[in-house]
């Protein structure tokens, strides 16, 4: 396997694009187990109707690659666990990608992204100690291809659940 | 050990407001979002209001446009000022953190009641 991009390994912030620049997606700093920061994307809009932001990666170089996947480790509330909010409240987030020679794209249209598919929280998870809290991580991957662009970028829309991406790892197989 | 306090509830008229304040101790406030609930006699609770670390708000529908959640984290206090006050508000209030990362509730403070009269 060949890595493209780990959001584990980025120093610093990721500083990805989030739309509506306020309100939607929040970059985050945890401390894992060996007090190693974390930087996830939070959201948790569940009081309010119809949400809908976005977070799109940095360009990815494909790097000649056909078919690229992508492993997302995630948590996500059961609406159950949050009360009073079952009218609003979303246990499902959206992927999408966008293929692009360009890598500095200021501004891609929402219906210019592919969607990759509806991801929802997995019956099993992995329980990973976070200080005093046990933190229950969803691991999904999904592939996409054939590519023909030099590179591409990805997209998380999020439309109304409390999600937080933990890591995002993309990568291809090689041959 | 965690402690959650409320503070701030009464009895006030309809049309009235009230500042209700929370002080947390025994945690930091590293969660992604602190909130209130209410929990008005025999319904369930409900999030009415969350602030994140960032400053950004969220409210019910039956609250939007009345109240204002804030918060302090120098101080680890969050506070949720109501104007416009009705009936239907009269509930216990409680302060907790909600984070997408796992279940903040293992902990709930006491709770500050408010009556709306009409």
């Known amino acids: 396997e060949v890595t493209l991009l780990d959001s584990r390994s980025v120093q610093g912030e990721l500083g990805w694009i989030a739309s509506p620049l306020e309100g939607g997606w929040e970059e985050v700093s945890i401390m894992d187990e060996k007090n190693t920061p974390i930087r996830t994307y939070q959201v948790c809009n569940v009081m309010e109707p119809s949400q809908n932001n976005w977070l799109r990666t940095d360009w990815i170089t494909r790097e000649g690659a056909q078919r690229v996947y992508i492993e997302i480790k995630f948590t996500l509330r059961d609406c159950n666990s949050l009360p009073g909010v079952m009218g609003t409240c979303k246990e499902t987030f959206n992927l999408y990608y966008y293929e692009s020679d360009n890598d500095k794209e200021r501004f891609i249209r929402e219906n210019q992204f592919v969607k990759i598919d509806t991801i929802a929280a997995d019956e099993s998870f992995t329980q990973v100690d976070i200080g005093d809290r046990i933190m229950k991580l969803n691991t999904e991957i999904r592939d996409v291809g054939p590519l023909s662009k030099k590179g591409f970028y990805l997209a998380f829309q999020d439309v109304g659940a409390c999600i937080a991406l933990v890591s995002v790892r993309v990568f291809y197989k090689k041959a | 050990q965690v402690q959650l306090q409320e503070s701030g509830g009464g009895l006030v008229q309809a049309g009235g407001s009230l500042r209700l304040s929370c002080a947390a101790s025994?945690?930091?406030?590293?969660?992604?979002?602190e909130a209130w609930f209410r929990q008005a006699p025999g319904k369930e609770r409900e999030m009415i209001a969350a602030?994140?670390?960032?400053?950004?708000?969220n409210y019910a529908n039956p609250v939007k446009g009345r109240f204002t959640i804030s918060r302090d984290d120098a101080k680890n206090m969050v506070y949720l000022q109501m104007n416009n006050l009705k009936p239907e508000d009269s509930a216990v209030y409680y302060c907790?953190?909600?984070?997408?990362?796992?279940?903040?509730?293992?902990?709930w403070g006491p709770g500050t009641q408010v009556t709306v009269s009409s």
């Open positions: 907790n953190a909600i984070s997408p990362l796992w279940d903040e509730y293992d902990f």
């Open positions: 025994g945690r930091t406030f590293n969660s992604y979002a």
């Open positions: 602030v994140t670390k960032a400053g950004t708000t």
